[in-house]
């Protein structure tokens, strides 16, 4: 049986994404997981 964490592992920087929640950085920009951006 696949461990639970494997099913919900977050995507690395540079991976394709559709939503912020998919990314380890919690930012999906231009369909890529990106560094979170500081609010100046």
């Amino acid at each position: 049986m696949t461990p639970f964490w494997r099913g919900v592992s977050l995507r690395p920087i540079g991976a394709s994404c559709r939503d912020d929640s998919e990314c380890i950085t919690r930012l999906c920009r231009k369909r890529r997981c990106s560094l979170s951006v500081a609010q100046e």
Epitope: R11, I13, T25
Partner: antibody, heavy 120, light 112 residues
Framework: EVQLQQSGTVLARPGASVKMSCKAS????????MHWVKQRPGQGLEWIGA????????SYKQKFKGKAKLTAVTSASTVYMELSSLTDEDSAVYYC?????????????WGQGTSVTVSS | DIVMSQSPSSLAVSVGEKVTMSCKSS????????????LAWYQQKPGQSPKLLIY???TRESGVPDRFTGSGSGTDFTLTISSVKAEDLAVYYC????????FGGGTKLKIK
């Protein structure tokens, strides 16, 4: 040939601010995140943050928010890092570096480092 | 943050010996969709900037001698130098780039 040329050694007083530069050449400056890494004397490497010169987006490690400020001047292909409210803990060598690809942060180009000494 | 731990912190070997050093991450660096490990190794010689040796855990950077080999997957990684040369005197760091970059504490290689 890619080059990252950093500004020279800095001696500063506690409480002061310093601004150092990293001038890039030999690649498309606006297409890569430029990262800054701190190395205290005899210690390891610590990521401070990064700037994307194409749109000036910045990202910081939590502990450096309010301490470091990154800016970029695309016309000069130069990134700057300003450190404020200096303490002895800020005495270190600071490197600018960038990755193999836009979102591949294995850093294959490094500046020579800027040494900052904070002393009264 | 993903925490990177390296061991040993230092080791002394004779020229020609094989050396291995370890790097462990607090969470898996393997991305299942591309089967790549987001891990790099650097060499920093005294007074110099770090130099990239290995990325994707096992891909040697252009120009790096083939005596340097990276291996491992998930959370456990190893850098091996098959036959140490005097010029390999340096500190070796691992770094993950799965998330915000973090580095291990380094392994200092001394030559006997």
């Amino acid at each position: 040939e890619v080059q990252l040329q950093q500004s020279g050694t800095v001696l500063a007083r506690p409480g002061a601010s310093v601004k150092m530069s990293c001038k890039a050449s030999g690649y498309t400056f606006t297409s890569y995140w430029m990262h800054w890494v701190k190395q205290r004397p005899g210690q390891g490497l610590e990521w401070i943050g990064a700037i994307y010169p194409g749109n000036s987006d910045t990202s910081y490690k939590q502990k450096f928010k309010g301490k470091a400020k990154l800016t970029a001047v695309t016309s000069a292909s130069t990134v700057y890092m300003e450190l404020s409210s200096l303490t002895d803990e800020d005495s270190a060598v600071y490197y600018c570096t960038y990755g193999k690809e836009e979102y591949l942060f294995a850093m294959d180009y490094w500046g020579q480092g800027t040494s900052v000494t904070v002393s009264s | 943050d993903i925490v990177m731990s390296q061991s040993p912190s230092s080791l002394a070997v004779s020229v020609g010996e094989k050396v291995t050093m370890s790097c462990k991450s607090s969470q898996s660096l393997l991305y299942s969709s591309n089967q790549k490990n987001y891990l790099a190794w650097y060499q920093q010689k005294p007074g110099q900037s770090p130099k990239l040796l290995i990325y994707w855990a096992s891909t040697r950077e252009s120009g790096v001698p083939d005596r340097f080999t990276g291996s491992g997957s998930g959370t456990d990684f190893t850098l091996t130098i098959s036959s140490v040369k005097a010029e390999d005197l340096a500190v070796y760091y691992c770094q993950q780039y799965y998330s915000y970059p973090t580095f291990g504490g380094g392994t200092k290689l001394k030559i006997k």
